[in-house]
């Protein structure tokens, strides 16, 4: 059986954000999955793309957010699983040769995904093939289903293809073209931050903001560091002692309508130790069980 | 070339339900939205719903739920628009359209006693 | 629903000249995900159906000559006929896709 949350190189303690660029080398973040997304169903096609996480040979953990259509943005429409792509064991985007891609089976938002406030942000992918895991795909452990989450001041990881670049805004992107994705992939270490201060900050802030308790926050007061556009359903991992494995605790969700990184505006995370019972059950095939590791 | 025909004119009674046929041609049929739009001398454009014919998957303009109902027939790659309790505010040209680009040639609905 | 407001509601000019025409949206109309502005230009002549001219606020639709150009981000929004034609004769509508579709008044263009 495949072990979950042990990659076969060691992650470093010193890590730099995705803000800013620090590239992950091979191997760092096996259970780390390219999501691209083409929408054909529309007029001109939409294409976007997001991360997720190997839970097992033949699942992908992400948020839901990335496998909606994005066309009607007050509308919860999930993309048919035709126009779904899955890279596994992907380092640089340019280069696609050493990768696994699958095509998916079936995708599955959660039923209560609310596209105002982001509360329920979880999917799953099923693929079509399982994935030949190796040295650079393996999967990532569930933690165990309790409602509290991750404490506050612990330190996590989070890896992704989105924005590296803070100083370009969304619609000097639109207007200039500029590249401003990461062709490597990049990775953050990032603190836990509280609910009362998360909630707090969002509150503060004109706009209609909502931290749920199925929602945690990470990141620095002074900003800096931090998940950006594209970096979306992506795996927030923490370490844990005990079993001496990572445990996707988050997924990259939302954060605040300013740059990326800004100063005391936390990235939110959806808070994966909710939705354990329900990722199990809807992965609830004889093989899917079997296949799936979770913390104990 | 890909075309959207459309039935053919409809004078209706205040309170009976029409429905309204647009064939599509030049394409696969069941991976594109077909969209209906809703046009009234002096209202402009107003945009009733989409349907998903592959699917059956539909979104609907709030201000038309309980009024458009849309179903498609993958085998004639047929889409249908079905209007009920009609009154003289129904009274309009209608469109079909796939997604954002190609328009049909329009059916013109009038109802009166 | 996104409120579209279009200026001015017509317009008259001489053949030749350059035409620019707005659209405005109640909110933003530019996805972060895709990077794309949902709004696009229609054409509606007499007694005819519309027919697209731009999608993504300014990408030009195969067919459409090129003195039309739509361009704008967010929630302004301008399309320009660089050199009208007696053919241009139409009424522009925009139409937003960003959530459920509203269209604008529409602006009637006459050619004197």
């Known amino acids: 059986l495949p072990v979950c949350g042990q990659p076969s190189r060691a992650l470093p303690n010193l890590v730099k954000r995705i803000i800013g660029g620090r590239n992950a080398e091979l191997g760092l973040f096996p259970w780390q999955a390219l999501i691209v997304v083409e929408d054909t169903s529309r007029i001109p096609n939409d294409k976007w793309f997001g991360s997720g996480a190997l839970l097992s040979e033949s699942w992908i953990l992400t948020a839901a957010h990335v496998l909606r259509s994005q066309r009607r943005d007050n509308t919860v429409i999930p993309v048919s699983k035709d126009h779904v792509t899955v890279y596994l064991g992907l380092h640089d985007v340019r280069d696609k040769s050493g990768a696994v891609n699958s095509s998916a089976a079936r995708v599955v938002l959660h039923p209560d995904f609310n596209i105002q406030n982001y509360n329920h942000d979880i999917a799953l992918v099923q693929l079509q093939e399982p994935v030949p895991l190796g040295a650079h795909v393996m999967p990532i452990c569930l933690p165990r289903p309790e409602p509290e989450g991750p404490a506050p001041h612990m330190l996590g990881l989070v890896a992704g293809w989105g924005i590296s670049n803070p100083n370009v805004t969304v619609d000097e992107i639109i207007i200039s073209g500029t590249r401003t994705l990461s062709d490597v992939l990049q990775y953050v270490k990032l603190p836990v931050v509280s609910h009362a201060e998360c909630k707090a900050s969002y509150e503060s802030r004109s706009g209609n903001y909502s931290v749920t308790e199925n929602m945690f926050c990470a990141g620095y007061y002074e900003g800096g560091k931090d998940t950006c556009l594209g970096d979306s359903g992506g795996a927030f991992v923490i370490f844990d002692e005990m079993s001496q494995r990572w445990v996707a605790q988050g997924l990259v969700s939302w954060g605040g309508p300013e740059e990326c990184g800004s100063k005391q505006v936390y990235g939110v995370y959806t808070k994966v130790s909710n939705y354990v019972d329900w990722l199990l059950e809807e992965m609830n095939s004889p093989r899917g069980v079997r296949e799936l590791q979770v913390e104990r | 070339q890909v075309q959207l025909k459309q039935s053919g004119a409809e004078l209706m009674k205040p309170g009976a339900s029409v429905k309204l046929s647009c064939k599509a041609t030049?394409?696969?049929?069941?991976?594109?939205?077909i969209e209906w739009v809703k046009q009234r001398p002096g209202h402009g454009l107003e945009w009733i719903g989409e349907?998903?014919?592959?699917?059956?998957?539909?979104n609907y303009n709030e201000k038309f739920k309980g009024k458009a109902t849309f179903t498609a027939d993958s085998s004639s790659n047929t889409a249908y628009m079905q209007l009920s309790s009609l009154t003289t505010e129904d009274s309009a040209m209608y469109y079909c359209?796939?997604?954002?680009?190609?328009w049909g040639t329009g059916t013109t609905v009038t109802v009166s006693s | 629903d996104i409120v579209m407001t279009q200026s001015p509601s017509s317009l008259a000019v001489s053949a030749g000249e350059k035409v620019t025409m707005s659209c405005k949206s109640s909110q933003s109309l530019l996805n972060s995900r895709t990077r794309k502005n949902y709004l696009a230009w229609y054409q509606q002549k007499p007694g005819q159906s519309p027919k697209l001219l731009i999608y993504w606020a300014s990408t030009r639709e195969s067919g459409v000559p090129d003195r039309f150009t739509g361009s704008g981000s967010g929630t302004d929004f301008t399309l320009t006929i660089s050199s009208v034609q007696a053919e241009d004769l139409a009424v522009y509508y925009c139409?937003?896709?960003?959530?459920?579709?509203?269209f604008g008044g529409g602006t009637k263009l006459e050619i004197k």
């Open positions: 349907i998903l014919p592959g699917t059956g998957s539909t």
């Open positions: 359209l796939r997604s954002e680009d190609v």
């Open positions: 139409k937003q896709s960003y959530n459920i579709p509203t």
């Open positions: 030049g394409y696969t049929f069941t991976g594109k939205w």
